[in-house]
């Protein structure tokens, strides 16, 4: 009778230890459950020791000892006869024989289904000589068995031109069905048909498939693997799996969730990253995408001033990177900002609105109608101007900066004066006579210094000149400031 060793039984001593290349270093026992890493511990079958020779192919040596006693017949010891194991597991089996030391150059070869196994296998023959006999143990290991490893394995030993053959060791690679294709998670449009595929193989074959939806079988009659399930459409999320059955039992695939695409949830946590006078950088956390990738987002901006006309500015942007710089805003203004994003199904609701403010900026225009004239009696230059329009001040005026440059006979000197925000005139002392004074004025806010006005020049005569007239910025369209003396 064939001795059979199944994975769930221990008919022979089992030697533990994973095959090299596995992640294990602790060499756990063979018959433990499969490891999370996917490594299957090996089945290893020892020679029976000391063991009883079988009565199969026996070589009866013709050599006699000194006392002329014939030597006992040589035969391989019995070992396991039939190994059934699952695909991808490791297995090791061996042949053992004790050979009198008078024999030299004994070699053992492994054969499978009548063909000698050469190379590409882990086969080792070990020799343990004693006083009179040498124990020879030939071990054959397969790290990860495949269906192609099924078959009958024997050892052959040539000795004295005789061939000793072991009993066969039958390797049967089989087990529960193994999935080659499992259903995949999908996001589908409501009430739209879709397909799921499941494929599993033995051995043993055939493998039959049952489909399961939300823990209930879909098909009463099994389908032969591979199986395609056509679902006419869903109105709500469902979980599908498939069961693969063969004579060894049942394997259940992973459960996959089929989701129904919907409009996204509104973005959350809209926040201000940075504010300048004319721009606001915002970020947001996208809401749930509704099982459909975001396509783009819309930033809605309203002036928060109750006197504003309530118009909404809309800025469209890509869905990534959840960051947008809103430009072309007014300085020192309050805005309400909301974000909405869309997927293939539609737009989300708008996020909760947040309030944001632009900062003060430097004025965007210079003071207007700059006029300069000489007050000779007091040896001063009087300067007058008009403040920039309120909308273009971009903040609260804190004053003005006056630049006056004095040029005479190749010498040039620039002086700066700061004046308060009240009023629109200033007086500066004459620095140099018989010289040209060039005046420019800029408005100042806490946001910075605005642009300087166009230069206005006035000639300061030597002492004793009487006639003078004011100098002023040119009317629009004139190329150069007018100099009147």
């Amino acid at each position: 009778a064939i001795t059979e060793a199944r994975e769930e039984a221990k008919p022979y001593p089992l030697f533990p230890g994973p095959f090299p290349g596995s992640l294990q270093t602790d060499h756990t026992p063979l018959l433990s459950l499969p490891h999370a890493s996917g490594y299957q511990p090996a089945l290893m079958f020892s020679p029976t020791q000391p063991g009883r020779p079988h009565t199969g192919n026996v070589a009866i040596p013709q050599v006699t000892s000194v006392e002329s006693k014939p030597l006992p017949p040589l035969a391989f010891k019995h070992t396991v006869g039939h190994i059934i194991l699952s695909e991808h597991k490791g297995v090791k089996f061996n042949c053992s024989i004790s050979v009198p030391n008078i024999y030299q150059d004994t070699t053992i070869s492994w054969w499978k289904d009548g063909k000698e196994l050469l190379g590409a296998h882990h086969a080792i023959t070990q020799f343990y000589p004693d006083d009179e006999v040498t124990a020879i143990i030939a071990s054959f290991s397969i790290t990860s068995v495949q269906r192609s490893d099924n078959g009958s394995y024997i050892c052959k030993m040539k000795i004295n031109n005789e061939e000793i053959v072991s009993d066969p060791i039958y390797i049967e690679v089989q087990g529960l069905p193994h999935f080659t294709k499992q259903p995949e998670s999908m996001n589908v449009t409501r009430n739209t048909a879709f397909n799921l595929t499941c494929q599993a193989v033995g051995p043993p074959e055939p493998v039959n498939i049952f489909w399961v939806q939300n823990s209930s079988r879909v098909n009463e009659q099994p389908e032969k693997s591979p199986s395609v399930l056509t679902v006419p459409g869903l109105t709500e999320m469902a979980v599908f799996s498939c069961e693969a059955h063969n004579d060894k039992g049942l394997t259940v695939s992973k459960g996959v969730q089929i989701n129904i695409k919907a409009i996204p949830s509104p973005p959350t946590e809209v926040s201000i990253r940075n504010s300048t006078a004319h721009s606001i950088l915002i970020s947001w956390v996208p809401g749930f995408d509704g099982y459909s990738p975001f396509r783009n987002c819309s930033i809605q901006v309203k002036e928060a001033d109750p006197l504003s006309n309530g118009s909404v500015m809309i800025f469209n942007t890509s869905a990534l990177p959840h960051l947008y710089q809103i430009k072309q805003l007014q300085a020192l203004a309050n805005y309400s900002i909301g974000v909405s994003c869309m997927n293939e199904i539609g737009w989300s609701a708008v996020s909760p609105w947040i309030l944001a403010s632009t900062t003060e900026g430097a004025p965007s225009v210079a003071p207007l109608n700059v006029t300069v004239f000489l007050n000779e009696s007091s040896d001063n230059v009087d300067i007058r101007w008009m403040k920039p329009p309120t909308k273009q001040q971009d903040g609260e005026l804190v004053g003005y900066r006056i630049s006056h440059v004095w040029q005479s006979a190749g010498i040039s000197k620039e002086l700066l004066e700061e004046v308060g925000q009240n009023g629109s005139r200033a007086r500066i002392s004459v620095q140099v006579h018989n010289a040209t004074c060039t005046v420019r004025i800029a408005a100042v806010t806490r946001g910075g210094v605005g642009p300087f006005s166009d230069p206005v020049k006035i000639f300061i005569p030597a002492h004793g000149w009487v006639d003078y007239a004011p100098s002023s910025t040119p009317a629009p369209g004139n190329a150069d400031p007018v100099l009147i003396i």
Epitope: P18, P20, P29, M44, I124, Q126, Y128, S139, S141
Partner: antibody, heavy 122, light 106 residues
């Protein structure tokens, strides 16, 4: 994980018997494998002494066979070495180790105990 | 018994050097050979088995080659922690070890 720990007297008189025990933890000796003893004389190389399996089956180094006994006690998860008629030449670090059985019956040694020094002196 | 002869018995090398140690068996042992590293006061640790298979967790700078009677252990770029004694061991028959090769700092 599997660990091995040698124990026994560090000093033995000439002609007496050296006795060491190796306690195995993190793994059951009954699960299989051969379990071996290796020694290393001061400043010298490594010498395999012998190995035993869970059933008590032994292999001994031909050069030490006449003086060595290795036994196993699966109930205590330990195995032992006895080396009789010791001389100063037996002074060495003695290591216990598991003989892996990945390829054959007795392959390489992994892991090893940390070793214990035994001095033979009167 | 199968004897293993290692050469050289010692060598001096610098960090970054390529180091080669050989092990010769007195008779053919196929690929039934392992290499160990031993540091002072410590037990040997397996580096290579089956003549050329790298033990899990051993740096890839270690490699083994050979079959039959001649075997080689190579350290491609010696690191400070590699200064130690290296042994070969055959498992074709009763285990025997080479006499060791000590790798010292030059």
């Amino acid at each position: 994980q599997l660990q091995l720990q040698e124990s026994g007297p560090g000093l033995v008189k000439p002609s007496e018997t050296l006795s060491l025990t190796c306690a195995v933890s993190g793994y059951s000796i009954s699960s299989g494998n051969y379990w071996g003893w290796i020694r290393q004389s001061p400043g010298k190389g490594l010498e395999w002494i012998g190995s035993v399996d869970h059933s008590g089956s032994t292999y001994y180094s031909p050069s030490l066979k006449s003086r060595v006994t290795i036994s196993v006690d699966t109930s205590k998860n330990q195995f032992s070495l006895k080396l009789n008629s010791v001389t100063a030449a037996d002074t060495a670090d003695y290591y216990c180790a598991r003989n892996t059985m990945i390829r054959g019956v007795m392959d390489w040694f992994d892991p090893w105990g940390q070793g214990t020094l035994v001095t033979v002196s009167s | 018994a199968i004897q293993l002869t290692q050469s050289p018995s010692s060598l001096s090398a610098s960090v970054g050097d390529r180091v080669t140690i050989t092990c010769r068996a007195s008779q053919g042992i196929s690929s039934a050979l392992a290499w160990y590293q031993q540091k002072p006061g410590k037990a040997p640790k397996v580096l290579i088995y089956d003549a050329s298979s790298l033990e899990s967790g051993v740096p890839s700078r270690f490699s083994g080659s050979g079959s039959g009677t001649d075997f080689t252990l190579t350290i491609s770029s010696l690191q400070p922690e590699d200064f130690a004694t290296y042994y070969c061991q055959q498992f074709r028959s009763y285990p025997t070890f080479g006499q060791g090769t000590k790798v010292e700092i030059k």
